[in-house]
């Protein structure tokens, strides 16, 4: 690895996964690197192999236990290191004291389904995945609907400022194909960010009844 701009960013999914991305300009693609996690008050250590995701960045997931197990708390600090093999030894390339509940990114919401659809309205529900019970109801959501002829980037964001795992979309056009996505964010954490968007849910509004005003 060479000297260059380096960045080491990790997020905790609030249960049993820390996902990390390491980027370094000028680093060699075929260099063998890993992330090592060393908690300050736990008996376990964990390692994952960094795999290339682009020309100068690598990513890996530290799997700390069963997906729904609560492996870390708000008082934990985990020292995270990027180690790269240089000849016969491992060299530390980056290091940070990681506070899991200050760096949260939850899993994307799952199980999206149409609860009820009409000509102009659609009620959709979803579930959150692998989210800590510590949050209680302190979560918020963003949702977006893809209309025909538009892109996701153009879709207006709908904000749900509470833990509400459903939405009623209104003012839709009859007999029209739409797609819907949602993402979640805990209110806690200085560096907390939005989850990835959910898988899109496709749905179609009902056609208008013949001979009636719409």
């Amino acid at each position: 690895a060479v000297n260059g701009t380096s960045q080491f960013t990790c997020f905790y999914n609030s249960r049993a996964n820390i996902s990390c991305v390491w980027s370094q300009d000028g680093a060699l693609q075929d260099t063998s690197c890993q992330v090592h996690a060393w908690p300050d008050r736990r008996r376990w250590n964990q390692t994952c192999e960094l795999l290339p995701v682009s020309q100068a960045s690598w990513a890996c997931n530290l799997i700390l236990g069963a997906p729904d197990s609560q492996k870390l708390t708000t008082v934990d600090i985990v020292t995270l290191r990027v180690l790269c093999r240089e000849g016969v030894r491992w060299r530390v390339m980056a290091i940070q004291d990681f506070k899991p509940f200050e760096n949260l990114r939850l899993m994307a919401p799952i199980s999206l389904q149409v609860v009820h659809v009409e000509t102009h309205r659609c009620n959709i529900s979803w579930e959150i995945s692998q989210a800590s019970h510590y949050f209680e109801r302190h979560l918020e959501f963003e949702a977006r609907t893809l209309s025909p002829g538009h892109t996701w980037e153009e879709a207006p964001l709908l904000t749900l400022k509470q833990k509400q795992e459903w939405i009623c979309l209104e003012t839709l056009t009859p007999d029209t194909q739409y797609e819907f996505q949602v993402r979640v964010k805990p209110l806690q954490g200085e560096f907390t960010t939005w989850s990835p968007w959910s898988q899109p849910l496709a749905f179609r509004t009902k056609p208008a009844a013949l001979g009636k005003d719409t």
Epitope: N3, S6, Q7, F8, W38, D40, T79, R81, V82, W90, R91, V92, M93, A94, I95, Q96, D97
Partner: nanobody, 126 residues
Framework: EVQLVESGGGLVQAGGSLRLSCAAS????????MGWFRQAPGKEREFVAA????????VYVDGVKGRFTISRDNAKNTVYLQMNSLEPEDTAVYYC???????????????????WGQGTQVTVSS
């Protein structure tokens, strides 16, 4: 490669003071944190103190807090360890170390450091 040369060690009575210096040369632009470690006879090398590139962050092992102060002068590429109220238990060879690792921790380990000095002997007599 980075070269490190320590100086300032010696024999001192308990309660006395010493100031260790560590001069860095070579690829000093690549240095991030610098630290001091020590190794007493028959014991493993242990972390003493570290300082960030800017000097804004420092960390000490519990046994030296309040007695030792680490500082750095980037213009001179030198790091210092001011040791006050020395105790016989502080007797050891003191090593300066530098790391190119990006970032900061309060839990430095020997393996985090790439470059090492030859060490300077500190002996505290009772």
């Amino acid at each position: 490669e980075v070269q490190l040369v320590e100086s300032g060690g010696g024999l001192v009575q308990a309660g006395g003071s010493l100031r260790l210096s560590c001069a860095a040369s070579g690829r000093t632009f690549s240095i991030n944190a610098m630290g001091w470690f020590r190794q007493a006879p028959g014991k493993e090398r242990e972390f003493v103190a570290a300082i960030s590139r800017s000097g804004g962050s420092t960390v000490y092992v519990d046994g030296v807090k309040g007695r030792f102060t680490i500082s750095r002068d980037n213009a001179k590429n030198t790091v210092y360890l001011q040791m006050n109220s020395l105790e016989p238990e502080d007797t050891a060879v003191y090593y300066c170390a530098a790391t190119m690792a990006v970032g900061w921790t309060t839990r430095w380990r020997t393996a985090d450091f790439d470059s090492w000095g030859q060490g300077t002997q500190v002996t505290v007599s009772s």
